[in-house]
């Protein structure tokens, strides 16, 4: 009955253990699922997170090649070069200058293309308009792209179009053969014929920039 | 001995699941250190991402700011008037325009003044060096903005600023007196004094539009 | 070259008139006025006026208003000067110069006026 | 009348020497100034205008500064034929008024 009482006594001491042991492991299973729900939780804000900052990243992508489009623009509409150089003249889509030596038509035509551009070439009478106006204060004869070979020939302008008959009528030595060629200058507002070796002032033409106006 | 023998299983049977229990409670230790550990990292991912949200939406604030910015000055130079209006030349930092009227100086300083303009005004020695050779292959003489009540009265430009003598020296009548005044012209480079009532062309000048340029 | 020739000495009673003479050349006569200058014995220069050849008009200083008459023939590039009503003090060398500042000047004529 | 005085009216001074003479203008002039030299029975000869500018063929040891109302002529190193009367005149305004003139003397 000692052996007994002694095991009883164990088995009291080893029950309480036990049931201390159990109550240790529930209160640490509730802990661990509060813990996993903590964790759930965190998780969720990680996502969270993660996704915002995503976000924010295609945002500033977003923003930043806005930025680079606005700063592109601005660099091409800043030069927004003037629609003529300087000490040209800008009247509807082109550019002219008179140029203030004397050559002959070759040497006028040479000067032209080094600045980027022809000798004048009159489109339309509102052209003509411009011309007969700009140089009115003038009585000194100005070379334009206009030129032939000799009377069997058609009169052509420097990009090879033909001269319409109804802008303006030629005046001068329209039927006369010169080595050089024949052509055309304008002077007080009329268009006349003449050795091309001779030397006159010149009216230079070109497009104007008026991509950025 | 027989309670005794079941005492002794009993007490088996508990030890056995003390020490199932004790092992429980030691795995679930390691896994609640591990959780804790793993809830620490969670910590600190969030701790990370939320320091890179809060970069990110400076970033962009900076961003968006700089886009407002850029838009503002594009609106601002898309608009990029040309530097000076049509007809007009071009030249440094100033437009000029050259009449195709001729009139008095009074009535030829209106006409500048309606155009935003002012007669022309020579500051220095490449404005005029400018000026004499956009007027070459002119034999008129054009009015420019400067004038003398009568030879007791200094020359004067229309803002009221007196002729520096280094810039040109005044040819024609420079010591009559007119009752309209004297005022200067501009002929083949050279500047005369002459009576205001007669008539001349006449070179209007304005400032450049440059802000864009 | 530019030169201005004017007319020889003077003498000439007090009272009455003289007129200086003064040829240009070298330049477009019409394009710059001529001063007149005067320089009294041992004295210095007294500026008289000018006349513009172009338009043919004069101006004239305060003190010789009404006595000093200034002219020109542009057909012979020549200005004048005339003086009337002398005295003694008229006595001087005049010059003729073109053009402000003065460039070119003549060589003078001495006008001597004495009773 | 705009009064023009010069200073000194003599001065006497040796070759090779820097010689500095005056104008004093009774109001601004911006300038319009020039500087002639007379020798003696001679035309005076324009020497400076604008009050800085060397007139062509004029040797380059004269030079003229100032502004406003004061104005100077330098000869920056006196030669035996600079011997003369130097007289400056405005030319701003009628009556163009000359400087009663300064006699330079070789010492």
């Known amino acids: 009955s000692q052996v007994s009482n002694l095991l009883k006594q164990q088995q009291t001491n080893l029950t309480h253990q036990k049931n201390k042991l159990e109550g240790q492991i529930s209160a640490r299973q509730q802990a661990e699922e509060a813990s996993q729900e903590s964790q759930n939780e965190l998780k969720e804000m990680i996502e969270t997170l993660a996704w915002k900052l995503n976000e924010k990243s295609k945002e500033q992508m977003e923003l930043h090649h806005q930025n680079l489009n606005l700063q592109e623009t601005l660099k091409r509409v800043a030069n927004c070069s003037a629609p003529c150089p300087q000490d040209w003249i800008w009247h509807e889509e082109n550019c002219y200058l008179f140029s203030t030596g004397s050559f002959n038509w070759e040497k006028s035509q040479e000067k032209c293309l080094s600045l980027d551009a022809k000798l004048l070439k009159i489109n339309s009478t509102a052209d003509l308009d411009f011309i007969q106006q700009a140089i009115s204060y003038s009585s000194f004869p100005f070379w334009m792209g206009l030129s032939r070979r000799n009377p069997s020939y058609p009169w052509l302008w420097e990009d090879g179009s033909p001269l319409m008959p109804h802008l303006f009528r030629i005046r001068g030595a329209v039927s006369q053969t010169y080595p050089s060629g024949t052509c055309a200058y304008i002077q007080r507002g009329a268009v006349y014929a003449e050795n091309c070796i001779l030397a006159a002032f010149s009216i230079c033409q070109k497009k104007a920039n008026l991509r950025a106006q | 001995s027989q309670v005794s023998n079941l005492l002794k299983q009993q007490q088996t049977n508990l030890t056995h699941q003390k020490n199932k229990l004790e092992g429980q409670i030691s795995a679930r230790q390691q896994a609640e250190e591990a959780s804790q550990e793993s809830q620490n990292e969670l910590k600190e991912m969030i701790e990370t991402l939320a320091w890179k949200l809060n970069e990110k939406s400076k970033e962009q604030m900076e961003l968006h700011h700089q886009n407002l910015n850029l838009q503002e000055t594009l609106k601002r130079v898309a608009n990029c008037s040309a530097p000076c209006p049509q007809d007009w030349i071009w030249h440094e930092e100033n437009c000029y325009l050259f009449s195709t009227g001729s009139f008095n100086w009074e009535k030829s300083q209106e006409k500048c003044l309606s155009l935003d303009a002012k007669l022309l005004k020579i500051n220095s020695t490449a404005d005029l060096d400018f000026i004499q050779q956009a007027i070459s292959y002119s034999s008129f003489p054009f009015w420019m903005g400067l004038s003398r009540r009568n030879p007791s009265y200094p020359w004067l430009w229309e803002d009221g600023s007196p002729l520096m003598p280094h810039l040109f020296r005044i040819r024609g009548a420079v010591s009559q007196t007119y009752p309209s005044g004297t005022c200067a012209y501009i002929q083949r480079g050279a500047v005369y004094a002459e009576n205001c009532i007669l008539a001349a062309f006449s070179i209007c000048q304005k400032k450049a539009n440059l802000r864009a340029q | 070259q530019v030169q201005l020739v004017q007319s020889g000495a003077e003498v000439k009673k007090p009272g009455a008139s003289v007129k200086v003479s003064c040829k240009a050349s070298?330049?477009?006569?019409?394009?710059?006025?001529v001063h007149w200058v005067r320089q009294a014995p041992g004295q210095g220069l007294e500026w008289m006026g000018a006349i513009h050849p172009g338009s043919g008009g004069a101006a004239y200083v305060q003190k010789f208003q009404g006595r000093v008459t200034m002219t020109r023939d542009t057909s012979i590039s020549t200005a004048y000067m005339e003086l009337s009503r002398l005295r003694s003090d008229d006595t001087a060398v005049y010059y003729c110069?073109?053009?402000?500042?003065?460039?070119?000047w003549g060589q003078g004529t001495l006008v001597t006026v004495s009773s | 009348d705009i009064q023009m005085t010069q200073s000194p009216s003599s001065v006497s001074a040796s070759v090779g020497d820097r010689v500095t003479i005056t104008c004093r203008a009774s109001q601004g002039i911006t300038n319009w100034l020039a500087w002639y030299q007379q020798k003696p029975g001679k035309a005076p000869k324009l020497l400076i205008y604008?009050?800085?500018i060397l007139e062509s063929g004029v040797p380059s040891r004269f030079s003229g500064s100032g502004s406003g109302t004061d104005y100077t002529l330098t000869i920056s190193s006196l030669q035996p034929e600079d011997i003369a009367t130097y007289y400056c005149?405005?030319?701003?305004?009628?009556?163009?008024?000359f400087g009663q003139g300064t006699k330079l003397e070789i010492k």
């Open positions: 604008a009050a800085s």
């Open positions: 110069a073109r053009w402000l500042p003065m460039d070119y």
């Open positions: 070298g330049y477009t006569f019409t394009d710059y006025e």
């Open positions: 005149q405005q030319y701003l305004i009628t009556p163009y008024t």
